[in-house]
Interface confidence: low
């Protein structure tokens, strides 16, 4: 249905509130270095225009598209060649050259400084003050972190963001009360913005045949009772909501989502028993809660598949008939089955499926050829069933810290040519596999730990195509996006790297590592670890546990002298020395 | 149950070639990675190369081997092979094919499943 003004319509869709808020979220996705004020400055200025539009929808410049009239905006601002550099020139361009110039240069590793949380009362203060900007400060810091949020979400955290301190400023334990909300918040929000980058990189990288192929899998999991049919309609929708999203065009992904949250609400009973307490909900929670919904129960008398994917004399014909739905169909047959299994693991039986077709369908007896089409599938379950077991072993063995730390010498070994940072960013993530996922009941571990393996490694592609310095992370991120957790798990130590020459300013520290919370201590001694690791790629575990040990104990005699730097300026070089020997 | 049977197997000259196959049948092929490995009389088994699943664009090779032997694969003919070149006396083994559906790619042989029995490679001087 077209509009004479994109603009009016979207405003009218949304309400003002959600406008506002998604139009700076746009912005400050788009000019992330941006001040906050310059921000609340276009959007009031665009807010503005849009009144114009729905007042009068013929009005001057009503009918320009959305990219033409946020770009336009975009490209007033009078720093942008100083700020940006080369984005600037983004605004040579024509629609919709621009938006896609603006798109390429998000940058998910911004050079901004970590948020420093203020003490409670001076955030109640700044939340009693004045609310809308509190807010909107709120969506403005995390948006331009994460340049890829998925943006109705957000406006849900935001809102959830604003209950907490609605609640908690009145209450007896300011901090008691908000901190443990905000923490919540925070680690959901890193955990959501890292889950939407990887559909972003489906999306992009991969093209809307791997995100389809993705939600046929997870929705079929979610919904085993509904119908092909259904599937496939909720997955044309959901592609398109994300395609928009992860394009910028967050008007209208927010208001697709909510056509989209209407009609799951309305349609339940071909979907899913597990809607009911969604759909109750107000909009953004219930969004948010029908895309978390746990899995419905899988109808009790389903046949086997091997009648209409193996045993079948049509299964070449049926294929070379509509073959992405004929695979669609498989993966939804397959992905309903099997809660069990992760999207990734079902993506690849579905992937060795249609290589076996392509292989056999040419073949002189088909049916012979694919008869043992399903013993295929034995190795590829077995392997991720594997490495579940051996790594919730080691974490069980070893805890979150020891095992995050058998994760940094194992990628740093695989990939040494990897920023340290980056290593240990992604690292510490992979090792958080362990307490999310290892406590739960088996028919649950996997889909947990490799789904979440699949996000935390898309990270490290994100970062690293920023930049490229290792081949082997280029083939594993660009090769297969559902063999990208075995590519990296089949990577050996790198016997061509050079190891880095050792710095023994490296491996100096002060005094201000005693004040340091645990999580930075852990990070520090991480980020040693990977050095170490850099310096000498063959050294034993055995070596780095004795010298990762000497460490503890030498930061922890340090930390309890009178004289703390001149501890750390004495012992230090005796540190470095015995490690450099140990390792020899 | 997958079987393994490897062929190729030959008394050759040092210096000489030789290509070693092993075919799989009972279970498709493309999921596992594929290994080679030789036990010389009185010596523990020790690993040659192995080829990681699907397309079998990883490889892995013993130091001994490398630049020498290659190791391929042939997704639709169920079969892995090993081209070994410029053999030396000290290459003499039995050499046994495996299957590993334990990781993409693996050179421990605790992490390989199926084993097939072995073809004789004999290196004279």
């Known amino acids: 249905d077209t509009h004479k003004s994109e603009v009016a319509h979207r405003f009218k869709d949304l309400g003002e509130e959600h406008f506002k808020g998604l139009v700076l979220v746009a912005f400050s996705q788009y000019l992330q270095q941006c001040p906050f004020e310059e921000h609340v400055k276009l959007v009031n200025e665009v807010t503005e225009f849009a009144k114009t539009c729905v007042a009068d929808e013929s009005a001057e410049n009503c009918d320009k598209s959305l990219h033409t009239l946020f770009g336009d905006k975009l490209c007033t601002v009078a720093t942008l060649r100083e700020t940006y550099g080369e984005m600037a020139d983004c605004c040579a361009k024509q629609e919709p050259e621009r938006n896609e110039c603006f798109l390429q240069h998000k940058d998910d590793n911004p050079n901004l400084p970590p948020l420093v949380r203020p003490e409670v009362d001076v955030m109640c203060t700044a939340f009693h003050d004045n609310e809308a900007t509190f807010l909107k400060k709120y969506l403005y810091e995390v948006a331009r972190r994460h340049p890829y949020f998925y943006a109705p979400e957000l406006l849900f955290f935001a809102a959830r963001y604003k209950a907490a301190f609605a609640e908690c400023c009145q209450a007896a334990d300011k901090a008691a009360c908000l901190l443990p909300k905000l923490d919540e918040l925070r680690d959901e929000g890193k955990a959501s913005s890292a889950k939407q980058r990887l559909k972003c990189a489906s999306l992009q990288k991969f093209g809307d045949r791997a995100f389809k192929a993705w939600a046929v899998a997870r929705l079929s999991q979610k919904f085993p009772k509904a119908e092909f049919a259904e599937v496939s309609k909720l997955v044309t929708d959901l592609t398109k909501v994300h395609t928009e999203c992860c394009h910028g065009d967050l008007l209208e992904c927010a208001d697709d989502r909510a056509d989209l949250a209407k009609y799951m609400c309305e349609n339940q009973d071909s979907i899913s028993s597990k809607l009911k307490e969604c759909c109750d909900k107000p909009l953004l929670e219930k969004s948010h809660c029908l895309a978390e919904v746990e899995n419905d129960e899988m109808p009790a008398d389903l046949p086997s598949l091997a009648a209409d994917y193996v045993e079948s004399k049509d299964v070449c014909k049926n294929y070379a008939e509509a073959k992405d739905v004929f695979l669609g169909m498989f993966l939804y047959e397959y992905a309903r089955r099997h809660p069990d299994y992760s999207v990734m693991l079902l993506l690849r039986l579905a992937k060795a499926y249609e290589a076996t077709l392509e292989k056999c369908c040419a073949a002189a007896d088909p049916h012979e050829c694919y008869a043992k089409v399903f013993d295929e599938f034995q190795p590829l379950v077995e392997e991720p069933q594997n490495l579940v077991k051996q790594n919730c072993e080691l974490f069980e063995q070893l805890g979150e810290y020891k095992f995050q730390n058998a994760l940094l010498v194992r990628y740093t070994k695989k990939v040494p040519q990897v920023s340290t940072p980056t290593l240990v960013e992604v690292s510490r993530n992979l090792g958080k596999v362990g307490a999310k996922c290892c406590k739960l009941p088996e028919a649950k571990r996997m889909p947990c730990a490799e789904d979440y393996l699949s996000v935390v490694l898309n990270r490290l592609c994100v970062l690293h195509e920023k930049t490229p310095v290792s081949e082997k992370v280029t083939k594993c991120c660009t090769e297969s996006l559902v063999n990208r957790r075995p590519c990296f798990s089949a990577l050996e130590l790198d016997e061509a790297y050079v190891p880095k020459a050792f710095n023994a300013e490296t491996f100096t520290f002060h005094a201000d590592m005693c004040t340091l919370s645990e999580k930075e201590k852990q990070v520090k001694k991480q980020t040693a670890l990977v050095e170490l690791v850099k310096h000498k790629p063959k050294a034993t575990k055995e070596q780095l546990k004795g010298v990762m040990d000497n460490f503890a104990a030498f930061v922890e005699k340090c930390c309890k002298a009178d004289d703390k730097e001149a501890c750390f300026a004495e012992e230090g070089p005796k540190f470095v020395a015995a490690s450099q020997a140990a390792l020899a | 149950q997958l079987q393994v049977v490897e062929s190729g197997g030959g008394l050759v000259q040092a210096g000489g070639s030789l290509r070693l196959s092993c075919t799989t049948s009972?279970?498709?092929?493309?999921?596992?990675?594929m290994g080679w490995f030789r036990q010389a009389p009185g010596k523990e088994r020790e690993f040659v190369a192995a080829i990681s699943w699907f397309a079998g664009d990883t490889t892995d090779y013993a130091n001994s081997v490398k630049g020498r032997f290659t190791i391929s694969r042939d997704n639709a003919k169920n079969t892995v092979y090993l081209q070994m070149n410029s053999l030396k006396p000290e290459d003499t083994a039995v050499y046994v094919c495996?299957?590993?559906?334990?990781?993409?790619?693996?050179?421990?042989?605790?992490?390989?499943?199926?084993w097939g029995q072995g073809t004789q490679v004999t290196v004279s001087s």
């Open positions: 009972g279970r498709a092929f493309i999921g596992y990675a």
């Open positions: 495996a299957a590993s559906s334990a990781r993409p790619l693996s050179s421990r042989s605790d992490e390989y499943h199926y």
